[in-house]
């Protein structure tokens, strides 16, 4: 069956270059036109570039024209996107997508590869407790959490009590701060009566920086 | 370039409902229109091409129609697997423009948020920064307004919000709003409050604390 396997994404500084690859299998590569489409975090789909099956025709979106170059190597069954002079607004998941025969809609898609354009360097998070108190109690239910702050790049994973606690957990999508670093909160609601007896620990893992933090969250002692 | 405009941007519906999404082209594209479905973290999936031709393997509850500049995608009986974001795409011209997307979400019943406020931890204050977090838990619909007040003065530009995806069990959303200040600024003020407005609340709810008090 038709398969498009992408590689080459990663974190890159503004102004630098990156090359994405799209390796095709399950069809005669040299007969098909393949496109690049991207999707910025939380946004819609944006068509980026196309190269015809015979290589004669290349077309680019205005936003990337002059900076991005599409190419293909039929002997390797691979399509490339060379991205130069990268900008923060190029941060997106990039997809390669194959057309159906001669019609220019996208019947087959790659899995996507994330490109992050940022001047930030890899940094592990600081983990701070969001301690339960009378201000975070409502009708027999208490809320507590962890603030996972100032890390780069995405992602971090958060579990509670080594995965034993899942009910009532909300881990929020990360926000990009003006510093270029990410921050997120993970919270859990628990019975107020359990606060004195049950231990609550958030387990934070940031693989890019090899950082693991286990933070015990307890009521503030006054 | 041919511009594609989709409406609505969000559509709330229940399983079994008939739903319709509209896509308009800025100039005629004949029937050169495709529809895609996308779920979080996944690549888009082709549903429909040539405006009304169903892609192989796609259920017949998906119905496409239209030509020229006006197109619709109808789901005749919405099923659980259909809650997703839908995009139209014209392929009449070189620039294969997409619509901005329509998110089909589960229609829940109005639920007011539970509101909690968290002061910055002593650990964080030692680092020179103070984050105050306001949590809105398990509410519907998604629209909620959070306002920060410090010593009763409205804050702007120094907070960030994040909202969860709709909960698969109870259709609700949760939101966190984080007010970030320097330690010096934090220590200049006493009363920190977040005020929440939501359809499920008869009047705004305020949660607050006095700095330095338990």
């Amino acid at each position: 069956q038709v398969q498009l396997v992408q590689s080459g994404g990663g974190v890159v500084q503004p102004g630098r270059s990156l090359r994405l690859s799209c390796a095709a299998s399950g069809f005669t590569f040299s007969r098909y036109t393949i496109h690049w489409v991207r999707q910025a975090p939380g946004k819609g789909l944006e068509w980026v570039a196309v190269m015809s099956y015979n290589g004669n025709n290349k077309h680019y979106a205005d936003s990337v024209n002059g900076r991005f170059t599409i190419s293909r190597n039929d002997s390797k069954n691979t399509l490339y996107l060379n991205m130069n002079s990268l900008r923060p607004e190029d941060t997106a998941v990039y997809y390669c997508a194959r057309i159906r025969d001669t019609a220019m809609f996208f019947a087959h898609w790659g899995q996507g590869t994330l490109v992050t354009v940022s001047s930030a360097s890899t940094k592990g998070p600081s983990v701070f407790p969001l301690a339960p108190s009378s201000k975070s109690t409502s009708g027999g239910t208490a809320a507590l959490g962890c603030l996972v702050k100032d890390y780069f790049p995405e992602p971090v994973t958060v579990s509670w009590n080594s995965g034993a606690l899942t009910s009532g957990v909300h881990t929020f999508p990360a926000v990009l701060q003006s510093s270029g670093l990410y921050s997120l909160s993970s919270v859990v609601t628990v019975p107020s009566s359990s606060l004195g007896t049950q231990t609550y620990i958030c387990n934070v893992n940031h693989k890019p920086s090899n950082t693991k933090v286990d933070k015990k969250v307890e009521p503030k002692s006054c | 370039d041919i511009q594609m405009t989709q409406s609505p941007s969000t559509l709330s519906a229940s399983v079994g409902d008939r739903v319709t999404i509209t896509c308009r082209a800025s100039q005629s594209i004949n029937t050169w229109l495709a529809w895609y479905q996308q779920k979080p973290g996944k690549a888009p999936k082709l549903l429909m091409y040539k405006a009304s031709s169903l892609e192989s393997g796609v259920p017949s509850r998906f119905i496409g129609s239209g030509s020229g500049t006006e197109f619709t995608l109808t789901i005749s009986s919405l099923q659980p697997d259909d809650f997703a974001t839908y995009y139209c795409q014209q392929y009449n011209s070189d620039s294969k423009m997409f619509g901005q997307g329509t998110k089909v979400e589960v229609k829940g019943t109005v639920a007011a948020p539970s509101v909690f406020i968290f002061p910055p931890s002593d650990e964080q204050l030692k680092s020179g920064t103070a984050s105050v977090v306001c949590l809105l838990n398990n509410f519907y619909p998604r629209e909620a307004k959070v306002q920060w007040k410090v010593d009763n003065a409205l804050q702007s530009g120094n907070s960030q919000e994040s909202v969860t995806e709709q909960d698969s069990k109870d259709s609700t959303y949760s939101l966190s709003s984080t007010l970030t200040l320097s330690k010096a600024d934090y220590e200049k003020h006493k009363v920190y409050a977040c005020e929440v407005t939501h359809q499920g609340l008869s009047s705004p709810v305020t949660k607050s604390f006095n700095r330095g008090e338990c």
């Epitope: - | 229940s14 079994g16 409902d17 008939r18 809650f83 698969s168």
Partner: nanobody, 118 residues
Framework: QVQLQDSGGGLVQAGGSLRLSCAAS????????VAWFRQVPGKERELVAS????????YIEDSVKGRFTISTDNTKSTIYLQLNALKPEDTAVYYC???????????WGQGTQVTVSS
């Protein structure tokens, strides 16, 4: 949550008919949509037909269109699946299901076996 009791299955000759019933209790019947699924051993449950809360919007999968119909009797809180022109490949356990007002089917009948012999 709603409770569902499905019935009406049996052994029938190819070309024959059956009417499956799904009796609902526990919540106002008009408050939710109901669907019929079927499952062959070793395969996933597949949607066959569904009807919305008001009964004015029905959906029948292509594989059974023209042979199966779904209907509702609000007075009896019952949903029916009429199976006509049955084929051996229609042999399966048939389940009715309802979503608890949410984006998934979380209330299920216990299943009723339909066997079509050639």
């Amino acid at each position: 949550q709603v409770q569902l009791q499905d019935s009406g299955g049996g052994l029938v000759q190819a070309g024959g008919s059956l009417r499956l019933s799904c009796a609902a209790s526990g919540r106002t019947f008009s408050g939710y949509s109901v669907a019929w699924f079927r499952q062959v051993p070793g395969k996933e449950r597949e949607l066959v037909a569904s009807i919305n809360r008001s009964g004015d919007n029905t959906y029948i999968e292509d594989s059974v269109k023209g042979r199966f119909t779904i209907s509702t009797d609000n007075t009896k809180s019952t949903i029916y699946l009429q199976l006509n022109a049955l084929k051996p490949e229609d042999t399966a356990v048939y389940y009715c299901a309802a979503p608890y007002g949410l984006g998934r089917y979380d209330s299920w009948g216990q299943g009723t076996q339909v066997t079509v012999s050639s």
